[in-house]
């Protein structure tokens, strides 16, 4: 290789020396010198650092506050932060998942296209012709109208996006 034009990937420049960064899970205690190596220490309980670094303090693990509807999805380590998610029936308001809101319900005339998760809200879609939803729900899809013909019945009342068809007996007087 030609002479380097910077310190190596896992190094930083301090006082004319290219010193090793501290590995994930450790913080910097003292920079290397002409006489000594970089000194690093492991992060404490409930602390982490997720990159090669020269930080003198580790970051605190995220707190999943139950008062905000949060719970721990994955416990943090010395190298990773805690991951929070929401209690059943709730979802995160942002990617960082700092608080939760109740899943939205799909109104009558709309069905659930995608059920909500801990990180995404319910996605609703209007019931197309031939389908209906007569309830407000976070789980129910649009249901197909009843097929009167298969029951040897006739449509007495047409369905809508909110109501099923009403079937009735065949008019026996009709030729």
């Amino acid at each position: 290789p030609e002479p380097p034009t910077a310190c190596r990937e896992k190094q930083y420049l301090i006082n004319s020396q290219c010193c090793s960064l501290c590995q994930p899970g450790q913080k910097l205690v003292s920079d290397c010198t002409e006489f000594t190596e970089t000194e690093c220490l492991p992060c404490g309980e409930s602390e982490f650092l997720d990159t090669w670094n020269r930080e003198t303090h580790c970051h605190q693990h995220k707190y999943c506050d139950p008062n905000l509807g949060l719970r721990v999805q994955q416990k943090g380590t010395s190298e990773t932060d805690t991951i929070c998610t929401c209690e059943e029936g709730w979802h995160c308001t942002s990617e960082a998942c700092e608080s939760c809101v109740l899943h939205r319900s799909c109104s009558p005339g709309f069905g659930v296209k995608q059920i909500a998760t801990g990180v995404s809200d319910t996605i609703c879609e209007p019931c197309p012709v031939g389908f209906f939803s007569n309830v407000s729900s976070a789980f129910e899809k649009c249901h197909p109208w009843t097929s009167c013909e298969t029951k040897d019945l006739v449509v007495q009342q047409a369905g809508t996006n909110k109501t099923d068809v009403v079937c009735g007996p065949q008019d026996r007087l009709r030729a």
């Epitope: 290789p1 896992k10 970089t38």
Partner: antibody, heavy 125, light 107 residues
């Protein structure tokens, strides 16, 4: 304190392969490039190449291209140098050495600040 | 490849002598030069890097100078523990090469 401890002496037949290990301690292994240098009996020093212990990417001197393989295991802070298709003129002491970089007058100056104790590889039929 | 030529190849000197070893490069290498000391059966030891910077722990009787193509290692007052072989190494152009060595012997 920084230490590079190499594996013991080896005797090999021509055409065989040898794998020399270099265990690092006293510093963050993935933070510094590791080099391999050899020295034939009574001769000077010959640079073979290096490995980036973080990524595992090696660079070999053209003379050894196709015969040398440099690897590492970061979990045990150890670098390896394997030389294949051995010939009698590969008889030498093989050293690992750590790279140090000094910054001065706008330039970055490398050198080898710590060396292993050396591993004698004898190739003889 | 850049060739490094050390002179002399052998040098007989007495304790207390001032000793100078020269290293000439076949092309300019700025200050990308290091000096190493090697004793029989031992690994090389870094003395000087960046042509003139003394490695920590190395006695101040050792000094380096030069840039471009001509470099010198000077031992101001030779001590018994300095009898060894000295190598220069260029780190300015691939492949990084070493001089053939200078053996300093007791007169």
């Amino acid at each position: 304190q920084v230490q590079l401890v190499q594996s013991g002496a080896e005797v090999k037949k021509p055409g065989a392969s040898v794998k020399v290990s270099c265990k690092a301690s006293g510093y963050t292994f993935a933070g510094y490039y590791m080099y391999w240098v050899r020295q034939a009996p009574g001769q000077g020093l010959e640079w073979m190449g290096w490995i980036n212990p973080d990524s595992g990417a090696p660079t070999y001197a053209q003379k050894f291209q196709g015969r040398v393989t440099m690897t590492r295991d970061t979990s045990i802070s150890t670098a390896y140098m394997e030389l294949s298709r051995l010939r009698s003129d590969d008889t030498a002491v093989y050293y690992c050495a750590r790279e140090k970089i000094y910054y001065g007058s706008g330039n970055y100056y490398p050198s080898f600040d710590y060396w292993g104790q050396g591993t004698l590889v004898t190739v003889s039929s | 490849d850049i060739q490094l030529t050390q002179s002399p190849s052998f040098l007989s000197a007495s304790v207390g002598d001032r000793v100078t070893i020269t290293c000439r490069a076949s092309q300019g290498i700025s200050s990308y030069l290091a000096w190493y000391q090697q004793k029989p059966g031992k690994a090389p030891k870094l003395l000087i890097y960046a042509a003139s910077t003394l490695q920590s722990g190395v006695p101040s009787r050792f000094s380096g100078s030069g840039s471009g193509t001509e470099f010198t290692l000077t031992i101001s007052s030779l001590q018994p523990e300095d009898f060894a072989t000295y190598y220069c190494q260029q780190l300015g152009s691939y492949p990084w090469t070493f001089g053939q060595g200078t053996k300093v012997e007791i007169k």
